[in-house]
């Protein structure tokens, strides 16, 4: 017997659907109507035939009461080929729901997204996460998607993007966006970062994550942030192969005084990089290749320094810096 495609936990909290059949019974998803967090994985199916069954131009207000009754707060949709028109239809209907967090992963969006009709309501998301989503529209995808969202988005995560650079002139500002995560885009690089951080479109960013994004030096990142007018409080550059030295011909970059936390763990560093901010609250240099204890003049003024997992540290030895945090146990790096 084939397993049920959808499973609802006994508390009506989590519902997971895995549609792997070539002709899935989509009505099975109705058991998820009372779940708070819903995950739908479509097994790589092409959802084009859906367009024949639904009227994508129908007024979504007719579904408002039905959709308002959904408890869903967080929705994940994955593994499908989705016509842009169908995506837009879904966003228009979900605008009447309580949905706060939307995750799209392993999707191929085909066709172009129509403009937002004047009478349409945008979706009031606080968090949007995209992983391995490709768009037929290339660089303009963010601007097209943005018009279907209300301006209150707080968290935006874009991983394994096929086009991590945006068409900046079309993108509107994200006034409430406090967290931007571009991690897991190894081809991004510092040039790509400059293209992705559209100047003055991200005025409220506090947390910027750039793990595994092909960054080369902290100074290069500093320059990209300065050019974009982005002043994060927290910057994660972990899991990049960083060079400790700075290109002598490169101009010095002044870090924003707003930056108080910098993560440089798992960065392959053999010495403390040059050009770090002068003062930090938190600096994580764990799981690097530091063969000797950093000298005070190599380090910023820092309250909380983590050096765990570097070769020079023997378990149980004290750290060379006041206020440092060290478990005395070398973590699995």
């Amino acid at each position: 017997t084939t397993p049920e495609p959808c499973e609802l936990d006994d508390e009506d909290f989590r519902c997971v659907c895995n549609f792997s059949e070539p002709q899935p019974d989509w009505s099975e998803a109705f058991q998820c109507v009372s779940a708070v967090e819903v995950e739908i994985h479509a097994g790589g199916l092409n959802l084009e035939p859906f367009l024949k069954r639904v009227d994508a131009d129908a007024d979504p207000r007719q579904y408002a009461d039905t959709v308002k009754a959904l408890r869903v707060r967080r929705l994940t949709v994955g593994a499908a080929q989705v016509p842009a028109q169908l995506l837009v239809g879904a966003l228009r209907v979900l605008a009447y729901s309580r949905l706060k967090e939307l995750t799209l992963e392993d999707l191929k969006i085909t066709g172009t997204m129509p403009p937002l009709p004047l009478e349409a309501t945008g979706l009031a998301l606080s968090s949007l996460r995209l992983r391995n989503v490709s768009w037929a529209t290339g660089r303009s995808w963010l601007a097209e998607l943005q018009q279907w969202l209300k301006p209150g988005l707080k968290v935006l995560s874009i991983a394994q993007a096929h086009s991590p650079a945006f068409s900046c002139e079309q993108v509107r500002a994200f006034p409430a966006l406090t967290s931007l995560d571009l991690s897991d885009n190894p081809g991004l690089g510092e040039r790509g970062l400059m293209a992705a951080l559209c100047p003055h479109k991200f005025p409220a960013i506090q947390n910027l994550a750039l793990r595994n994004t092909g960054m080369e030096t902290p100074t290069g990142v500093c320059a990209a942030l300065a050019a974009a007018g982005v002043q994060p409080h927290s910057l994660d550059l972990s899991h990049n192969s960083l060079r400790a030295t700075v290109n002598p011909s490169a101009p010095r970059c002044m870090w924003s005084s707003a930056l108080n936390s910098l993560n440089l763990s798992f960065a392959g560093l053999e010495q403390v990089p040059k050009g770090l901010p002068a003062k930090l609250r938190v600096l994580d240099l764990s799981c690097n290749r530091l063969n000797r204890a950093p000298q005070p003049d190599e380090l910023p003024e820092v309250d909380n320094l983590t050096l765990d997992g570097n070769p020079f540290l023997v378990p149980g030895t004290a750290l060379p810096h006041e206020g440092s945090m060290n478990s005395g146990v070398v973590p699995a790096c």
């Epitope: 936990d9 508390e11 009506d12 909290f13 989590r14 109507v33 009372s34 708070v36 967090e37 009754a69 959904l70 408890r71 707060r73 967080r74 309580r98 967090e101 968090s127």
Partner: antibody, heavy 115, light 111 residues
Framework: QVQLQESGPGLVKPSQTLSLTCTVS?????????WNWIRQPPGKGLEWIGY???????SYNPSLKSRVTISRDTSKNQFSLKLSSVTAADTAVYYC????????WGQGTLVTVSS | DIVLTQSPDSLAVSLGERATINCRAS??????????LHWYQQKPGQPPKLLIY???NLQSGVPDRFSGSGSRTDFTLTISSLQAEDVAVYYC?????????FGQGTKLEIK
């Protein structure tokens, strides 16, 4: 059988941050469900503070949202509450609770806000 | 926010008699076929204990003298034959919509 146990200081000074941890045994906090904090001022009713879900998603009571952070440490199977800028009105028994129909409760810990 | 109002605030019932507590919601707590309204019992110095979930389902281990009914905005907890150990404060709670809210409580005593 899932068990929850709150821990943290019983006395916090006004304007400081209240920090509590809930240790969960018999169930993984990443497998499903919502992991909540609920409080009860002495002699009063119950107030939901917020939750962190199995996925790491959080939801907070709007009346406390600006002061609350709920986080988790999956390696220790723990979730934590931080409530900043506390006043005497935050004196209460704080419970950690599993689910949205609150079937599993910790014993609760009394936190007094006083100088 | 959904406001839950319990009535009465306190109740005195003779042993063996029926006790009824009402809970009214400021808006519907139903989502499709389910009513996300639950009932709890709290004794002094203890955390609340779930009695009834989704309006009418008896939680495992709870005596069957406890029952719940209702839908949308009006709900009732009934104790068919009051026992001495049922003296406690009873709360209703909704989980249809955040913030998840409780009623103000009903104190049940023996007459």
């Amino acid at each position: 059988q899932v068990q929850l146990q709150e821990s943290g200081p019983g006395l916090v000074k006004p304007s400081q941050t209240l920090s509590l941890t809930c240790t969960v045994s018999g169930y993984s906090i990443t497998s499903d469900s919502a992991w909540n904090w609920i409080r009860q001022p002495p002699g009063k009713g119950l107030e939901w503070i917020g939750y962190i879900s199995y996925s790491g998603s959080t939801s907070y009571n709007p009346s406390l949202k600006s002061r609350v952070t709920i986080s988790r440490d999956t390696s220790k199977n723990q979730f934590s509450l931080k409530l900043s800028s506390v006043t005497a009105a935050d004196t209460a028994v704080y419970y950690c609770v599993r689910g949205l129909r609150f079937a599993y409760w910790g014993q609760g810990t009394l936190v007094t806000v006083s100088s | 926010d959904i406001v839950l109002t319990q009535s009465p605030d306190s109740l005195a019932v003779s042993l063996g008699e029926r006790a009824t507590i009402n809970c009214r919601a400021s808006e519907s707590v139903d989502s499709y076929v389910n009513s996300f309204l639950h009932w709890y019992q709290q004794k002094p110095g203890q955390p609340p204990k779930l009695l009834i979930y989704r309006a009418s389902n008896l939680q495992s281990g709870v005596p069957d003298r406890f029952s719940g009914s209702g839908s949308r905005t009006d709900f009732t907890l009934t104790i068919s034959s009051l026992q001495a150990e049922d003296v406690a404060v009873y709360y209703c709670q909704q989980s249809n919509e955040d913030p998840y809210t409780f009623g103000q409580g009903t104190k049940l005593e023996i007459k």
